[in-house]
Amino acid sequence: ESALITQQDLAPQQRAAPQQKRSSPSEGLCPPGHHISEDGRDCISCKYGQDYSTHWNDLLFCLRCTRCDSGEVELSPCTTTRNTVCQCEEGTFREEDSPEMCRKCRTGCPRGMVKVGDCTPWSDIECVHKESGTKHSGEVPAVEETVTSSPGTPASPCSLSG
């Protein structure tokens, strides 16, 4: 069964006029790539490259296309049925807890750890302890900072932003 977006979640002033007659539960909805007219009678196409809708809906407006930020590359353009897909540039990644920006991947693992995962657009390099093989949780400093810290003194984590 197709997913659909209805006006129930919208503010009252954004809702379209009620349909006079619905011969099925979904009559009065418009297909993906469209929104409904103010009088609720017609379906109006989203504008290619400007806005979109992904599901059957009775929205008065299509959703605005995302513009990729600097530091991101456009994987696929916005169409009337699908939003733009943006991805972090090579050497940067987007964390789940800070999805608003791409952050620089670390250049290497701290002393005593080995790299088991590369930098990808959605994850930093992955480091594990040589002996135990357990993952290092949280941010760890890059190789250069580890090397410069005094023996016996743990290096403090630094926050790298893209």
């Epitope: 297909p31 059957w56 009337t80």
Partner: antibody, heavy 119, light 107 residues
Framework: QVQLVQSGAEVKKPGASVKVSCKAS????????LHWVRQAPGQGLEWMGW????????KYNEKFKDRVTITADKSTSTVYMELSSLRSEDTAVYYC????????????WGQGTLVTVSS | DIQMTQSPSFLSASVGDRVTITCRAS??????VAWYQQKPGKAPKLLIY???TRHTGVPDRFSGSGSGTDFTLTISSLQPEDVATYYC?????????FGGGTKLEIK
């Protein structure tokens, strides 16, 4: 390959009804919207309405709303268009056509069904 | 309803000619226009959508352009098999409407 196969030609008297069928094959029936478009002899094309099997959504052109009924039998992947209170100006070739759930252009068409209304 | 006015309604050209068919919408339809080719006794075939995107398998001699209210279908070098009637269609707002057609023949 995608095929839309329509029922055969019909001759009807004014005031009668006609029911034309369109059997779809070669794709997932519930993923595309099916439409009815008609063409009077020597004339242009006129969109009548759609049926979407994925959620049973139906939309009619207001011009035909009182006389047309579009239904479907999902078990046989068939869509039907019934036009009632026929008049001579309803003489036309009736096409079913499909479109993806996006922009409203038609990528595949049935072969057409000629409906002749004559007393 | 949006009216789609096609011109000319009849066109005669020679093989190899560049042929242009125009379509004017009665109101702004953005780029939501499709073009179809229909041969006698056959169903229409999709050529162009979104004003300028060629449908799969359509020869590259067919091209479309335009936005807003004025649209053009161009055949860069007319071939004998292009003899047909051509229709524009707006897919911007329901009811979707078609132009009256342009009948193209070879001189």
């Amino acid at each position: 390959q995608v095929q839309l196969v329509q029922s055969g030609a019909e001759v009807k008297k004014p005031g009668a009804s006609v029911k034309v069928s369109c059997k779809a094959s070669g794709y997932t029936f519930t993923e595309y919207i099916l439409h009815w478009v008609r063409q009077a002899p020597g004339q242009g094309l006129e969109w009548m309405g759609w049926f979407y099997p994925g959620n049973n959504n139906i939309k009619y052109n207001e011009k035909f709303k009182d006389r047309v009924t579009i239904t479907a039998d999902k078990s046989t992947s068939t869509v039907y268009m019934e036009l009632s209170s026929l008049r001579s100006e309803d003489t036309a070739v009736y096409y079913c056509a499909r479109h993806e759930q996006g922009p409203g252009y038609f990528d595949y068409w049935g072969q057409g069904t000629l409906v002749t209304v004559s007393s | 309803d949006i009216q789609m006015t096609q011109s000319p309604s009849f066109l005669s050209a020679s093989v190899g000619d560049r042929v242009t068919i125009t379509c004017r919408a009665s109101q702004d339809v953005n780029t939501a226009v499709a073009w179809y080719q229909q041969k006698p006794g056959k169903a229409p075939k999709l050529l162009i959508y979104w004003a300028s995107t060629r449908h799969t398998g359509v020869p590259d001699r067919f091209s479309g352009s335009g936005s807003g209210t004025d649209f053009t279908l161009t055949i860069s070098s007319l071939q004998p098999e292009d003899v047909a009637t051509y229709y524009c269609q707006q897919h911007y707002i329901t009811p979707w409407t078609f132009g009256g057609g342009t009948k193209l023949e070879i001189k």
